[in-house]
């Protein structure tokens, strides 16, 4: 992962906005502050991005290497099955879900985990790089 502010002049790392990280064709924002799930979603949307939707195991593994034990909201919700915000199903990983009242998804270095959506967590935004 490249940080835009550090590598903005590097040809191999086309710039992402300040405080965003580059991986492949995408920019990622890892928040420091905490919000509930819907506020995290709104934060990302306001910056022309979306709450993290992970496409495959490789991307998930790379992001987990970057994360700590702290959970971060991702764009995953249980609406009659776990689905990403674009409507696609979660199919490359399992989510640890203990209760029906936990309907939003979060990720840390170890797992995808269901949580009640009101919990304040850090979050990850993702958008296509310029």
């Amino acid at each position: 992962l490249c940080q835009g502010s550090k590598y903005s002049t590097c040809a191999s790392c086309p710039s992402c906005p300040d405080h965003w990280m580059k991986y492949g064709n995408h920019c990622y924002y890892f928040s420091v502050e905490k919000k509930d799930w819907i506020s995290s979603l709104e934060f990302c949307l306001a910056r022309d991005s979306h709450l993290l939707m992970i496409t495959d195991k490789q991307e998930m593994s790379l992001l987990q290497d970057f994360l700590s034990e702290a959970f971060h909201w991702v764009g995953l919700r249980n609406n009659s099955g776990w689905r990403w915000e674009d409507g696609s199903p979660l199919n490359f990983s399992r989510i640890y879900s203990n209760s029906l009242v936990q309907t939003c998804g979060a990720i840390n270095k170890n797992s995808l985990q269901a949580s009640s959506c009101e919990v304040s967590l850090q979050w990850v935004c993702k958008k296509v790089s310029p």
Epitope: D36, F71, Y96, N98, S99, L100, V101, Q102, A106, Q113, A114, S115, S116, E118, V119, S120
Partner: antibody, heavy 125, light 112 residues
Amino acid sequence: QVTLKESGPGLVKPTQTLTLTCTFSGFSLSTFGMGVGWIRQPPGKALEWLAHIWWDDDKWYELALKSRLTISKDSSKNQVVLTMTNMDPVDTATYYCARVIYYGSRSAYYSMDYWGPGTTVTVSS
Amino acid sequence: DILMTQSPLSLPVTPGEPASISCKSSQSIVHSNGHTYLEWYLQKPGQSPRLLIYKVSNRFSGVPDRFSGSGSGTDFTLKISRVEAEDVGVYYCFQGSHVPVTFGAGTKLELK
């Protein structure tokens, strides 16, 4: 499948200390967002929350009983223990443990989504 | 402490007929985050309570759709569209928005 079961002495003498154990399965109390609480119900009366403990060992008590209560957990044994000192006949009740789900506040707003069958405690000399 | 007042305390119902239980809180139980943490529990005879409804109107897993919850602020209602024999028991409302969390005194539903 989530299950919880309470165990205790059944009969306690006044001024003695009550020790109750909640043994659970189907979830881990090390998992983010999980907790276990204790609720009691005196005969023919309503439910009363006593205490709960979260996955990270954060503990909360009913204020009026705080000086008498201690809650602890052993995540490896899947157990939560509640002790209540200086028992009195008015503490005669059925004591339940329940799993509680974190909604963002340590002290309140949670769901008790699974309950144990309860254990009856009688305080009498 | 927030007082949760349920009515009626006893509710005789003919099977197949609807039933409605009221729960009023002594002050608003809308949390500062905008959510209302009002739940309904059913305690069948000789059993422990079980969660029916959470956050005012959400049915918990396995709860039949004849059960519905509604309300806001301080006034809440549990409705059963068609009462069945297995619905007999004591229904408790519970508020988790403010410390200490509190239960109502219960409404005993029985068959006529």
